[in-house]
Interface confidence: low
């Protein structure tokens, strides 16, 4: 791996769907310094979960959060 990596990268992605009620917000990781594009969900416990933006459950979860909150996501 790289000698130094930003702490906002996702190195692996969640294999299982995260229950919607546990999700609070999300942000996209698109930095070229990271190994892969990802979405980081913030849970109600303020803990982060990395997920694959190409997965349907991830897209559905982002839509759900978008509908819950009028503020645009980065």
């Amino acid at each position: 791996g790289p000698a130094s990596v930003p702490t906002t990268c996702c190195f692996n992605l969640a294999n299982r769907k995260i229950p919607l009620q546990r999700l609070e917000s999300y942000r996209r990781i698109t930095s070229g310094k990271c190994p892969q594009k990802a979405v980081i969900f913030k849970t109600k416990l303020a803990k982060d979960i990395c997920a694959d933006p190409k997965k349907k459950w991830v897209q559905d979860s982002m839509k759900y959060l978008d509908q819950k909150s009028p503020t645009p996501k980065p």
Partner: antibody, heavy 120, light 107 residues
Framework: QVQLVESGGGLVQPGGSLRLSCAAS????????MSWVRQAPGKGLEWVSN????????YYADSVKGRFTISRDNSKNTLYLQMNSLRAEDTAVYYC?????????????WGQGTLVTVSS | DIELTQPPSVSVAPGQTARISCSGD??????VYWYQQKPGQAPVLVIY???NRPSGIPERFSGSNSGNTATLTISGTQAEDEADYYC??????????FGGGTKLTVL
């Protein structure tokens, strides 16, 4: 059921090399990250190294960085740990373990371990 | 790496409740995992994501995590629960950190 079987341990002199293998079965090996965790005799668990499911990224504990190399062959469902420049303090039972979920790492299944003894 | 601190030993009478603590700076902001290890055996995951039990783990095992301390609770402790227990968390660099382990003795 998930099975992880380590092999390749043994007695080696300081400065020597050893290659550990971990044969996986009972799950889709290529879909999971894999790790090596060691345990010195009578001591606690120490994380050694991680490798991503596709093998593209690897991570090491500072204590082994530059001496150990983790790799995998997804076509053979096998994980490896190449250990060079071995020291007495590397003496331990080495476990391979499967991990899932992130950005954190945790181990949902472990092998039974293989003992590495570094001594002259 | 996050430094995790566990008591070296905890004793409990059969049928009583055992509590094993794991402390670390802002540990409640991370998920904590607990492993049981019996002599000569590999570790077994008993709690994941702070308070979830994998299938096959008895209901008497539970976990919590807030502030700087995570706790593994074993209700109605049985003789077969005598083992070493390790807490584990992680760092942003995809590494794992273990506590020093706690030897649970069932009196």
């Amino acid at each position: 059921q998930v099975q992880l079987v380590e092999s390749g341990g043994g007695l080696v002199q300081p400065g020597g090399s050893l290659r550990l293998s971990c044969a996986a079965s009972g799950f889709t090996f290529r879909s999971y990250g894999m790790s090596w965790v060691r345990q010195a005799p009578g001591k606690g668990l120490e994380w050694v190294s991680n490798i991503r499911s596709d093998g593209s990224y690897t991570y090491y504990a500072d204590s082994v960085k530059g001496r150990f190399t983790i790799s995998r062959d997804n076509s053979k469902n096998t994980l490896y740990l190449q250990m060079n420049s071995l020291r007495a303090e590397d003496t331990a039972v080495y476990y391979c373990a499967r991990f899932e979920f992130t950005p954190w790492t945790y181990f949902d299944f472990w092998g039974q371990g293989t003992l590495v003894t570094v001594s002259s | 790496d996050i430094e995790l601190t566990q008591p070296p030993s905890v004793s409990v009478a059969p049928g009583q409740t055992a509590r094993i603590s794991c402390s670390g700076d802002n540990l409640g902001k991370k998920y904590v995992y607990w492993y049981q290890q019996k002599p000569g055996q590999a570790p077994v995951l008993v709690i994941y994501d702070d308070d979830n039990r994998p299938s096959g783990i008895p209901e008497r095992f539970s976990g919590s995590n807030s502030g700087n301390t995570a706790t593994l609770t074993i209700s109605g402790t049985q003789a077969e629960d005598e083992a070493d227990y390790y807490c584990q968390s992680y760092t942003a660099q995809s590494s794992a950190s273990f506590g020093g382990g706690t030897k649970l003795t069932v009196l």
